[in-house]
């Protein structure tokens, strides 16, 4: 393993597809993949009138957008479906939305507010 890289071997699993079929498929998913590919965890959810509705959580495979991210944070501004990914066992247990604002002229040192976490 590369020094400093957080290997992902398992992720929190949830799949609304299975839930609606009353099979209660939630748990811990082991992540499998080719030796030369990186493995990640992800979460995807909707915000319906301020209520968080998880769609899926589980393993995600070799995506450069997930490399070296220890926290699961969605940075897109107001997506229809929120998505985040991260590296490290069960790193998708908590996920957050923290849109990157386009600041044209900062007048002072920017302060990064702590993003809201959901779990």
């Amino acid at each position: 393993a590369i020094l400093g890289r957080s290997e992902t071997q398992e992720c929190l699993f949830f799949n609304a597809n299975w839930e609606k079929d009353r099979t209660n498929q939630t748990g811990v998913e082991p992540c499998y993949g080719d030796k030369d590919k990186r493995r990640h965890c992800f979460a995807t959810w909707k915000n319906i009138s301020g209520s968080i509705e998880i769609v899926k959580q589980g393993c995600w495979l070799d995506d450069i957008n997930c490399y070296d991210r220890t926290d699961c944070v969605e940075k897109k501004d107001s997506p229809e479906v929120y998505f985040c990914c991260c590296e490290g066992n069960m790193c998708n247990e908590k996920f957050s939305y923290f849109p990157e604002m386009e600041v044209t002229q900062p007048t002072s040192n920017p302060v990064t507010p702590k993003p809201p976490y959901y779990n």
Epitope: F13, N15, D21, Q25, E29, G58, F83
Partner: antibody, heavy 120, light 107 residues
Framework: QVQLVQSGAEVKKPGSSVKVSCKAS????????ISWVRQAPGQGLEWMGG????????NYAQKFQGRVTITADESTSTAYMELSSLRSEDTAVYYC?????????????WGQGTMVTVSS | EIVMTQSPSSLSASVGDTVTITCRAS??????LAWYQQKPGKAPRLLIY???SLHSGVPSRFSGSGSGTHFTLTISSLQPEDFATYFC?????????FGPGTKLEIK
């Protein structure tokens, strides 16, 4: 590397049942997501349902609900798909397939297919 | 049920060409879109998963893009072995559904 080997071709009468097996070689059978997909001659692909063996419960397409049963035997690393009340339109190649992840990112390993012919 | 449509249903191209196949979903499927290649008498083969991730062992001339309801598969510098039928599939919501296929023929 997982490999999936399916049982041989079947010829069945309308109204009867067929049970197709799918034996997996390689590790971690219990924690794989196994799906079944069928393809009628010259037609497209149709997802029937899937199972994660360690959970034991299957998820079915509404179209087949009540007529299909998907099971798995962890001791033999074998998944099964049983389809009952067969009709001529069930004539198809039936594939068992491994998914990349439990949340169904993509069907990456396919069995060789089992041809099921329903004819009187 | 999410209905998947593909266009064109068939196309002719020559070795070395670049071709693009489009897949549309009747509802948003986020990134849960895969592309498969199938040759006569053979099982389908996974090419692209999660809309744009290239599956292991698939040549880099295959690429996928899109999210939500509109997706594309592009094959650049067509090779003789690429002439086949291509299917898209959504796995965002059960029942998982496939497009009707696009048959890529040699010109």
């Amino acid at each position: 590397q997982v490999q999936l080997v399916q049982s041989g071709a079947e010829v069945k009468k309308p109204g009867s049942s067929v049970k197709v097996s799918c034996k997996a070689s390689g590790r971690h059978f219990g924690s794989l997501q196994i799906s079944w997909v069928r393809q009628a001659p010259g037609q497209g692909l149709e997802w029937m349902g899937g199972i994660i063996p360690i959970y034991g419960t299957a998820n079915y397409a509404q179209k087949f609900q009540g007529r299909v049963t998907i099971t798995a035997d962890e001791s033999t690393s074998t998944a099964y798909m049983e389809l009952s009340s067969l009709r001529s339109e069930d004539t198809a190649v039936y594939y068992c397939v491994k998914d990349l992840t439990w949340t169904n990112l993509g069907l990456d390993i396919w069995g060789q297919g089992t041809m099921v012919t329903v004819s009187s | 049920e999410i209905v998947m449509t593909q266009s064109p249903s068939s196309l002719s191209a020559s070795v070395g060409d670049t071709v693009t196949i489009t897949c549309r979903a009747s509802q948003g499927v986020s990134r849960w879109l895969a592309w498969y290649q199938q040759k006569p008498g053979k099982a389908p083969r996974l090419l692209i998963y999660a809309a744009s991730s290239l599956h292991s062992g698939v040549p880099s001339r295959f690429s996928g893009s899109g999210s939500g309801t509109h997706f594309t598969l592009t094959i650049s510098s067509l090779q003789p072995e690429d002439f086949a039928t291509y299917f898209c599939q959504q796995s965002y919501s059960t029942p998982f559904t496939f497009g009707p296929g696009t048959k890529l023929e040699i010109k």
